[in-house]
Amino acid sequence: MCYGKCARCIGHSLVGLALLCIAANILLYFPNGETKYASENHLSRFVWFFSGIVGGGLLMLLPAFVFIGLEQDDCCGCCGHENCGKRCAMLSSVLAALIGIAGSGYCVIVAALGLAEGPLCLDSLGQWNYTFASTEGQYLLDTSTWSECTEPKHIVEWNVSLFSILLALGGIEFILCLIQVINGVLGGICGFCCSHQQQYDC
């Protein structure tokens, strides 16, 4: 197995996932494509935790670029050992992966809390509140209750879809970073096995 190539694959995957997380989080600010709810502060409190922008997004780009950089050929040796520099880099990637685990973990936790609490919406009695908070997430299984939210239009579907996407993306990021921790430890201990002649496609 080539640890550098594996890291590069993980890095590229994380860049895509991070960009999707940022996009999903941004969409949460514009239910039904309207800006008024953000300006009136009629959005779920968990939207303001920036879990997709920061946790699953920007914080994920740091380890992603570290992992991509591991595959570069200009990694210098040390102490007369060609692979020593690459081994050090692989081990240092573990630290970057741990940052990724923290970011994706934050994204997953906030998305799960956002799903459990439900959206802030104008209910059928004209109250802006967390209409489904008291149902402890049971509203997710009982779609007939979603009509209790009258504004923003389709807010329950919007929130459930986007927080579910953030939950899934954050979960995948978490798993990939976990794989890179194992990959980095193995690559650092076992040595950098790829010769310059070997070519692998991700």
Epitope: N32, L122, G126, E148
Partner: antibody
């Protein structure tokens, strides 16, 4: 002070349609929900449906689907309910009620009498 | 549809007495319950929502309680203006059905 002014009593023939109006005045908020409720003489209350005039989200009791159509005009702050294919069973007082911010305001009711 | 059952159907009490009206839902409605008061020939008045929150302008002698399927409206000191019919209504999922009503008379 918020007031809901409903249109006057209606005497209609079976099979005909009638459009009831409910004009809201004194509102300081844009977001509110307008409900319609039916009450037959000396009986209980029956929820017909609601409309959010801002988002145009409507929800109607299945029992009244095909019978009641809820609409609203934001510019005149008026909600409408059209009742079609009227029968004697539709003879009742129809109330509009507006909910917002922990308050509910009810119109005075419109008496609809279906008679040949 | 969720069925709302009120009891008693009618009751008579003296001014100054405490009164309790109960409402039972046919399934769990959490705290999605409202109470209304209607006097003869008048429009209903909104009293309580979310089972225990008093609507604006409602006197504090009234209080709502309960959750899941069992709810009650309490009047701790009955006043003359409290006579009329009381209705409960759930607002958990549509249709938002009302209870049959409790007619309160003053002795």
């Amino acid at each position: 002070e918020v007031q809901l002014q409903q249109s006057g009593p209606e005497l209609v023939k079976p099979g005909a349609s009638v459009k009831l109006s409910c004009k809201a005045s004194g509102y300081t908020v844009t977001s509110y929900v307008m409900h319609w409720v039916k009450q037959k003489p000396g009986q209980g209350l029956e929820w017909i449906g609601y409309i959010n005039p801002y988002s145009d989200v409507t929800n109607c009791n299945e029992k009244f689907k095909g019978k009641a159509t809820l609409t609203s005009d934001k510019t005149s702050s008026t909600a409408y309910m059209e009742l079609s294919s009227l029968t004697s069973e539709d003879s009742a007082v129809y109330y509009c009620s507006s909910y917002g911010g922990g308050f509910a305001y009810w119109g005075q009711g419109t008496l609809v009498t279906v008679s040949a | 549809d969720i069925q709302m059952t009120q009891s008693p159907a009618s009751l008579s009490a003296s001014v100054g007495e405490p009164v309790t009206i109960t409402c039972r839902a046919s399934k769990n409605i959490y705290t999605y319950l409202a109470w209304y008061h209607q006097k003869q020939g008048k429009s209903p008045q909104f009293l309580v929502y979310n089972a225990r929150t008093l609507a604006g302008g409602v006197p504090s002698r009234l209080s709502g309680s309960g959750s899941v399927t069992q709810f009650s409206l309490n009047i701790n000191t009955l006043h003359r203006e409290d006579l009329g019919t009381y209705f409960c209504q759930h607002h958990y999922d549509t249709p938002y059905t009302f209870g049959g009503g409790t007619n309160l008379e003053i002795k």
